[in-house]
Interface confidence: medium
Amino acid sequence: LPAQVAFTPYAPEPGSTCRLREYYDQTAQMCCSKCSPGQHAKVFCTKTSDTVCDSCEDSTYTQLWNWVPECLSCGSRCSSDQVETQACTREQNRICTCRPGWYCALSKQEGCRLCAPLRKCRPGFGVARPGTETSDVVCKPCAPGTFSNTTSSTDICRPHQICNVVAIPGNASMDAVCTSTSPTRSMAPGAVHLPQPVSTRSQHTQPTPEPSTAPSTSFLLPMGPSPPAEGSTGD
């Protein structure tokens, strides 16, 4: 690495280019200094004077080394279904991500433009593919021998309990009912939950454990109506 830094502006020789934090000014025909993140070019360079930089004003930013005449405006405030995971500063734009229980239906370069609540599978349907940061839950009908009696965005279809003597046969939305003798089950009792997608940037949201007999990694949050779809709850 060089022990010193050459002063700008200077004329680049043929075969050479301006260095990393410099730009070629077409008017001056010189390599000139870029402005650091959080600043913008107040006065452009000339053959004898370098770029004059100034700090970005409130609610504006520049994230990169630049020579823009004005800083960029920070995005609008996050909506109620979003969490601000990065505040607007002079060096970075505001980033809004979807809160737990929601997914990003329309993304932008950083963060999310439009969040939508995760689909809930109605009784008789279980989660085939869990929701992610950017995709909705996919529901599927419970296959013979399995059921789901909940309206949930995390529950999968569970196997019917196996009775020595069946009182009421199970169906897609109800477990089998046994006579008083002890039933056996192919899986552990209690609802089976899939983990709910949590935005990687949602560090400020404290998860609330869902009341359940079995441990769960899902979150219980007030949810609005889901868009109607096969196997999901309608309005």
Partner: antibody, heavy 119, light 111 residues
Framework: QVQLLESGGGLVQPGGSLRLSCAAS????????MTWVRQAPGKGLEWVSG????????FYADSVKGRFTISRDNSKNTLYLQMNSLRAEDTAVYYC????????????WGQGTLVTVSS | QSVLTQPPSVSGAPGQRVTISCTGS?????????VHWYQQLPGTAPKLLIY???NRPSGVPDRFSGFKSGTSASLAITGLQAEDEADYYC???????????FGGGTKLTVL
């Protein structure tokens, strides 16, 4: 490490031709402009010719324009100088050098090859 | 006659400071093109000492420093040592010649 190795020098009669080569290694050859610089016995350095990394742009000193041709074969990492219509005043040690990507200057030099033009 | 003008020789005693000047014109140094300095020890190829007016490549001692003002530049060597005895050349690009130009060279003698 960066290495530049010139070859092709020797004794040639006035009006004759010679082709110098410079084998480059230890760096991305296509990314750098290359140049030839000469030094007559007991004299100073004189820039002769230069070529851009891709080979599209070439530059010549007035003293060799029309007689010398610089070229490069990027597949072989080799720089060339074709010298025609040689004169006694072309007698010199010819150095090949790499041009620095940023700011300029010739940051690596070969050991040189001697060209003697004499009858 | 070189496009860039240097004194033919300079000398100094060990430990002293010497400067070598390089005078150009409005088409080279004065146009804003970088000035580069080379050291050539006897019987060897030139070595880049200073590039872009003031920059030292890694491995070059901080005893060597470059300066530029207007159409002139200079190389300063402090704490002169016997091994500094060599020829020194300045170089720049000249827009009117569309080529690189060297100074005539300066022979440094360490007394």
């Amino acid at each position: 490490q960066v290495q530049l190795l010139e070859s092709g020098g020797g004794l040639v009669q006035p009006g004759g031709s010679l082709r110098l080569s410079c084998a480059a290694s230890g760096f991305s050859f296509t990314s750098y402009a290359m140049t030839w610089v000469r030094q007559a016995p007991g004299k100073g350095l004189e820039w002769v010719s230069g070529i851009s990394g891709g080979g599209a742009a070439t530059f010549y000193a007035d003293s060799v324009k029309g007689r010398f041709t610089i070229s490069r074969d990027n597949s072989k990492n080799t720089l060339y100088l074709q010298m025609n219509s040689l004169r006694a005043e072309d007698t010199a040690v010819y150095y090949c050098a790499r041009q620095s990507q940023y700011v300029g200057g010739f940051d690596y030099w070969g050991q040189g090859t001697l060209v003697t033009v004499s009858s | 006659q070189s496009v860039l003008t240097q004194p033919p020789s300079v000398s100094g005693a060990p430990g002293q400071r010497v400067t070598i000047s390089c005078t150009g014109s409005s088409s080279n140094i004065g146009a804003g093109y970088g000035v580069h300095w080379y050291q050539q020890l006897p019987g060897t190829a030139p070595k880049l000492l200073i590039y872009g007016n003031t920059n030292r490549p890694s491995g070059v001692p901080d005893r060597f420093s470059g300066f530029k003002s207007g159409t002139s530049a200079s190389l300063a060597i402090t704490g002169l040592q016997a091994e500094d005895e060599a020829d020194y050349y300045c170089q720049s690009y000249d827009s009117s010649l569309s080529g690189w130009v060297f100074g005539g060279g300066t022979k440094l003698t360490v007394l």
